[in-house]
């Protein structure tokens, strides 16, 4: 017996192959002998099975000996044996359908669970793999879990199900609502604008929500709220915003915020928290600012970094076209008595640099 | 002899409605699936609607919600009733009969009748 | 839905030459293509069915083949009646598609 897995609510054709390619009587019928169709004269003709208005054949190839079976619309249910009867034999075909369905809504926040349930026939013993768009495997049976989504496993997945050393295959897109990066660092240099960019690592039609950014300063003994907005079909406006800084923020996606000036005292870490309307849970994204200040105070030329700076960052004092440096893993370097020229101060990881400012020493007469 | 005559075509303006029909002899109309197919001027041949024996109808996306297509076997006939027609709709519109169904292709074709969409 | 990629969109050729025409399809048609032949003012003439069955009173040098996504025409040796614009169909559903076609001209 022929086995023929399809899928819930695709369609199958089932074949059955006289031995002359000529056109001769045939019917298919399930396996409690009801007519589901046949020929009778030269035309289709329908029997009084409940699957007869979901079933077609092909006319062009009856007379090439070929008289399929086209069931539209699978439902688990179609799961049967059926037989073609044809030049006085019988062709036996087992049909399996089976349906994978995801049991939430398939956009869930980073960190969330995914659930995936096999529907299928009575008596079938079938195998999921799963194929996540990152290359992750994942196996099981009825069900198939992913504990915590990642933003990678964003997109299409692709889970095969196999039965009787058969298999058929089903595409579930999948849409791991976060942002684009965990966490970002903005260098900037003392007095510059800053600017923070929270870009979303998916898009939506409607996308409804509110959202807020706490800061805690590396010199503040507590955290505060810096902004809160509101997000209404992808347009953006300002609730609340602090006097100090006086941060702004556009209005388009994706969330943009201005602070007019790097200062020392707004140096540390952020968090921007989006919570979208009918979603349990929130999306975070971490920002640092780090800012620097190289000033000339009497002899002692200093340079500064506040804010959040790994420890193998380097900082260096360095006179333009001169040999003459200073660096250490610090977040102070300075030079007693520096030499009259431009000086940079210079913040870097593994020699790429992230930061640099630069001094006028003038001579002392 | 397999015949397909459609007529109802004509100038109509951006909007307005029109109906094709297409009177078919020669075979058993009632047990084949019919189609439209229009051609643009100087471009491809595009695949409109279906009906097949039993009644059931599929429609190509950039028709679905405008365009209707109907049988009436007692009178050998098949038609499409177009409304919210568009520029775009202007176009040689043919009717095909399928050799069977509408899981196959389709081996008779008419003449044509020409449907032009202008203000 | 389906496409059909068809080419070349246009070829010259003259009497006796062999001409092949292709047909590309965007997933599996399993076989369900039909050719067609069109000349200027007239409906579409059926040539071939199921890749390679010649529909009836089409002359023997039409000729099609393949299987898959990638299916041929062949014409092996071009008449003067053949010159005209061919067309591929998928109809591996009911919500058939054409390929652009192609128009075979006189060299």
């Known amino acids: 017996k022929k086995v023929v897995l399809g899928k819930k609510g695709d369609t199958v054709e089932l074949t059955c192959n006289a031995s002359q390619k000529k056109n001769t009587q045939f019917h298919w019928k399930n396996s409690n002998q009801i007519k589901i169709l046949g020929i009778q004269g030269l035309f289709l003709t329908k029997g009084p099975s409940k699957l007869s208005d979901r079933a077609d054949s092909r006319k062009s190839l009856w007379d090439q000996g070929c008289f399929s079976m086209i069931i539209k619309n699978l439902k688990i249910e179609d799961s049967d044996t059926y037989i073609c009867e044809v030049e006085n034999k019988k062709e036996e075909v087992e049909l399996l359908v089976f349906g994978l369905t995801a049991n939430s809504d398939t956009h869930l926040l980073e960190g969330q669970s995914l659930t995936l349930t096999l529907e299928s026939p009575p008596g079938s013993s079938p195998s999921v793999k799963c194929r996540s768009p990152g290359g992750k495997n994942i196996q099981g049976g009825r069900t198939i879990s992913v504990p915590q989504l990642e933003r990678q496993d964003s997109g299409t997945w692709t889970c095969t199900v196999s039965q009787d050393q058969k298999t058929v295959e089903f595409k579930i897109d999948i849409v791991v609502l976060a942002f684009q990066k965990a966490s970002s660092t903005v260098y900037k240099k003392e007095g510059e604008q800053v600017e923070f960019s929270f870009p979303l690592a998916f898009t939506l039609e409607k996308l409804t929500g509110s959202g807020e950014l706490w800061w805690q300063a590396e010199r503040a003994s507590s955290s505060k709220s810096w902004i809160t907005f509101d997000l209404k079909n992808k347009e953006v406006s300002v609730k609340r915003v602090t006097q100090d800084p006086k941060l702004q923020m556009g209005k388009k996606l994706p969330l943009h915020l201005t602070l007019p000036q790097a200062l020392p005292q707004y140096a540390g870490s952020g968090n921007l928290t989006l919570a979208l309307e009918a979603k349990t849970g929130k999306l975070h994204q971490e920002v640092n600012l780090v800012v620097m200040r190289a000033t000339q105070f009497q002899e002692n030329l200093t340079c500064e970094v506040w804010g959040p700076t790994s420890p193998k960052l380097t900082l260096s004092l360095k006179l333009e076209n001169k040999g003459a440096t200073v660096s250490k893993q610090a977040k102070a370097v300075w030079v007693l008595n520096p030499e009259a020229g431009m000086w940079q101060c210079l913040l870097s990881d593994s020699g790429q640099v992230l930061l640099e400012s630069n001094i006028k020493v003038v001579p002392t007469w | 002899e397999v015949q397909l005559l459609e007529s109802g075509g004509g100038l109509v303006q951006p909007g307005g409605s029109l109906r094709l029909s297409c009177a078919a002899s020669?075979?058993?109309?009632?047990?084949?699936?019919m189609s439209w197919v229009r051609q643009a001027p100087g471009k491809g041949l595009e695949w409109v609607a279906s009906?097949?024996?039993?009644?059931?109808?599929f429609y190509a996306d950039s028709v679905k919600s405008r365009f209707t297509i109907s049988r009436d076997n007692s009178k050998n006939t098949l038609y499409l009733e177009m409304n919210s027609l568009r520029a775009e709709d202007t176009a040689v519109f043919y009717c095909?009969?399928?050799?069977?169904?509408?899981?196959?292709?389709?081996?008779?074709w008419g003449q044509g009748t020409t449907v032009t969409v202008s203000s | 839905d389906i496409q059909m990629t068809q080419s070349p969109s246009s070829l010259s050729a003259s009497v006796g030459d062999r001409v092949t025409i292709t047909c590309r399809a965007s997933?599996?048609?399993?076989?369900?293509i039909a050719w067609y032949q069109q000349k200027p003012g007239k409906g579409p003439k059926l040539l071939i069915h199921?890749?390679?069955i010649l529909h009836p009173g089409v002359p023997s040098r039409f000729s099609g083949s393949g299987s898959g996504t990638d299916y041929t025409l062949t014409i092996s040796s071009l008449q003067p009646e053949d010159f005209a614009t061919y067309y591929c169909?998928?109809?591996?559903?009911?919500?058939?598609?054409f390929g652009q076609g192609t128009k075979l001209e006189i060299k």
């Open positions: 009906i097949n024996e039993w009644g059931s109808t």
């Open positions: 020669g075979f058993s109309f009632s047990n084949y699936a």
């Open positions: 169909l998928q109809y591996d559903n009911p919500l058939q598609t």
């Open positions: 095909s009969r399928h050799y069977g169904g509408s899981y196959d292709p389709m081996d008779y």
């Open positions: 199921y890749t390679s």
């Open positions: 997933q599996d048609i399993n076989k369900y």
